[in-house]
Amino acid sequence: STTKCTVSHEVADCSHLKLTQVPDDLPTNITVLNLTHNQLRRLPAANFTRYSQLTSLDVGFNTISKLEPELCQKLPMLKVLNLQHNELSQLSDKTFAFCTNLTELHLMSNSIQKIKNNPFVKQKNLITLDLSHNGLSSTKLGTQVQLENLQELLLSNNKIQALKSEELDIFANSSLKKLELSSNQIKEFSPGCFHAIGRLFGLFLNNVQLGPSLTEKLCLELANTSIRNLSLSNSQLSTTSNTTFLGLKWTNLTMLDLSYNNLNVVGNDSFAWLPQLEYFFLEYNNIQHLFSHSLHGLFNVRYLNLKRSFTKQSISLASLPKIDDFSFQWLKCLEHLNMEDNDIPGIKSNMFTGLINLKYLSLSNSFTSLRTLTNETFVSLAHSPLHILNLTKNKISKIESDAFSWLGHLEVLDLGLNEIGQELTGQEWRGLENIFEIYLSYNKYLQLTRNSFALVPSLQRLMLRRVALKNVDSSPSPFQPLRNLTILDLSNNNIANINDDMLEGLEKLEILDLQHNNLARLWKHANPGGPIYFLKGLSHLHILNLESNGFDEIPVEVFKDLFELKIIDLGLNNLNTLPASVFNNQVSLKSLNLQKNLITSVEKKVFGPAFRNLTELDMRFNPFDCTCESIAWFVNWINETHTNIPELSSHYLCNTPPHYHGFPVRLFDTSSCKDSAPFE
């Protein structure tokens, strides 16, 4: 092809090429043609004769102002036609008359101000029609019943002011899963406008200034329709009362989105008419007081999003939002509750009472004063089968004994990004009989004891990154009870002392993060008592991160037991010479990172076993000695291997000898070297 299109598997991508005409030299069997972001002004039908197999044509982001009806005659198999961001202003009965197999027609962002006559009447198979971002002043798309298979009608960002049955009843035989009318200036819902549609399942009116009064009228118009999903985000619904959603009593609504409404007052029984509701989005509002009956009637809600719904009005403590006790008691089916990023004063004794199916609760950054977790804090969750609890970013400084004793079903507890500073006696976790993961990373300090985790033997993941960990070298090890542990993160703790039995018995451990500590002394031969073999027995370890520990020595047998190791990161250390057989047992190794060390020589006797099955190697920024003895074997291996070696050309540079300084390692000439073949 003389054009710079890329062709792969019957797909031609000719986008962003400044084309002024359709290429005439592409393979005739292409089924998908992308001509977006060019300078096409016309689409002459004759130019498509050779591409009769096309099922998808995308000519978005051009300057097309007119479409030849004959285009689709040349493309009898066309299913998807995308004309978004062009300059179409008028559609006639003929424009798409031959596009009878279309399932998607995208006309968004053109200049179509009015649909005259019946330009879509032949699209009997159309599923998606996108007319968003045009200048349409009405929903009138035709004068007779049509588009019987349409499922998505997208009319957002137009100038529609009223919904009228005489315009919408051309959809009398359609089942619309999505009627998208967001970002219009709708001020009127004429009687019967939604009943004119055969079946309407989803209505989206985001960014429409409805307010409480028009919302009430809307809901009355939706009575006795098939509506399931209703989205009213950012619709200036500042208050709700027990009549706002009355009309929805005669529907089976399952999803309601009231987010971004600056909703201030949620009156009692506002949602009493929605017993079928399952998904309720209330995030980004301004609720000042949740009354005990505000949520009454929501017996079937499974998902409730209250993120940033309760925010304080001023600095004054008196202006903090209030949640009455038992406010959530009606939500018998609630499984997922998001209350992130709020300004709730604290957890009251009956705050969550009645949530008998709650499995996921996010309270991240939810409270203004939750400094201490006591044995009363979560009493209202005693009868909730909670699996996941997120308590991050709450400035929690202390966890008292039995704080979680009510949460016997809990599997994941996230306490990260707080200010916890205490000795962990182990009593904090009493009752967590099913715990799977505890995330404690990014806290103030944690002092471990032999019993810190004695009561949570089921724990499989423990995250203790950057918590100024103390007493990690106590004996017996604080981790000894954690026989089921598969992930342990002890990184960023400046740990200098650990015992060789710290991880003893953790035979299921798969991921161990020890990066950014100070473990260098432990592997020195000069260490009093010899090197500390703290990795012994970890026969199922898959990932080991030892980056940034200052290591300048590696004991020869330190990785001896790590038969299943797949990834090892030793980057940003001070390693120079590695013992000959150090990687001999790493037959499963897939990724090796030794970047930014002091390695000068990459010899077969050291690296041969490690490189055998490698898929990724990172040895960037090492001061390679470009001599036959040091790197001939490595260079030959590089040039034969299929291993991915990022930035090989630019970041693998010779340091010595001087005349090779700055020279790319891979270009080192090995032809004069003896016995340097990488594979035998």
């Epitope: 009965d93 005259k116 006559n117 032949k122 007779q144 019943v145 049955s165 009398a172 035989n173 019967g192």
Partner: antibody, heavy 122, light 107 residues
């Protein structure tokens, strides 16, 4: 086979109301694949469209600007027919009146009534 | 609104080709229908949607439409084709717009 049978008086006095009926056989006036209308032809003159009715969720009509203030076309679903009423007639309304079936989607007339000559005279 | 203009009359010798034009601004983007009317009879649809022929209409009738002109073509014109011919289209809210009609005379 669709047939349209017209009926109605052939003589109407000025200022009175012209009323014609078009009975349909072989199709339904409530069909959503066709529309129904009236056309007239003054002696020695061309065809003039008067109006149309079509059924979607309810009945809709469109009338020619020249007669809009005086015309009504109504369906009668029980008798499967539709009618034309033209008020305040004058001698200029003397013409042969045809009822017609408009075929979707582009409103070609595939069936015509036999035509009724209506004379407006005192 | 669309306006359709036809020549008042067209003459053709038997067996020759008659062409009747119907002009209108951008008529090519509208569908045009053609009706034949013989004296004392109701009109009959001879071409619909520019070029489609209803069943029972002889093959000598054909139509085309592009730009500002639609054309009805009768090839091998016969005496029985002598009649008035009307072009028609629709443009909401006027669901029918007729041309003024053309009298076809077979010499």
């Amino acid at each position: 086979q669709v047939e349209l049978q017209q009926s109605g008086p052939g003589l109407v006095k000025p200022s009175q109301t012209l009323s014609l009926t078009c009975a349909i056989s072989g199709d339904s006036v409530s069909s959503n694949s066709a529309a129904w209308g009236w056309i007239r032809q003054s002696p020695g003159r061309g065809l003039e469209w008067l109006g149309i009715i079509q059924k979607r969720s309810k009945w809709y009509n469109n009338y020619a600007v020249s007669v809009k203030s005086r015309i009504t076309i109504n369906p009668d679903t029980s008798k499967n027919q539709f009618s034309l009423q033209l008020n305040s007639v004058t001698p200029e309304d003397t013409a042969v009146y045809y009822c017609a079936r408009y075929s979707y989607p582009f409103y070609s007339i595939d069936y015509w009534g036999q035509g009724t000559l209506v004379t407006v005279s005192s | 609104d669309i306006e359709l203009t036809q020549p008042p009359s067209v003459s053709v010798a038997p067996g020759q080709t008659a062409r009747i034009s119907c002009s209108g601004d951008n008529i090519g983007s509208y569908y045009v229908h053609w009706y034949q009317q013989k004296p004392g009879q109701a009109p009959v649809l001879v071409i619909y949607e520019d070029s489609e022929r209803p069943s029972g209409i002889p093959e000598r009738f054909s139509g085309s439409n592009s730009g500002n002109t639609a054309t009805l073509t009768i090839s091998g014109t016969q005496a029985e084709d002598e009649a008035d011919y009307y072009c028609s289209s629709y443009d909401d809210p006027n669901f029918q717009v007729f041309g003024g009609g053309t009298k076809l005379t077979v010499l």
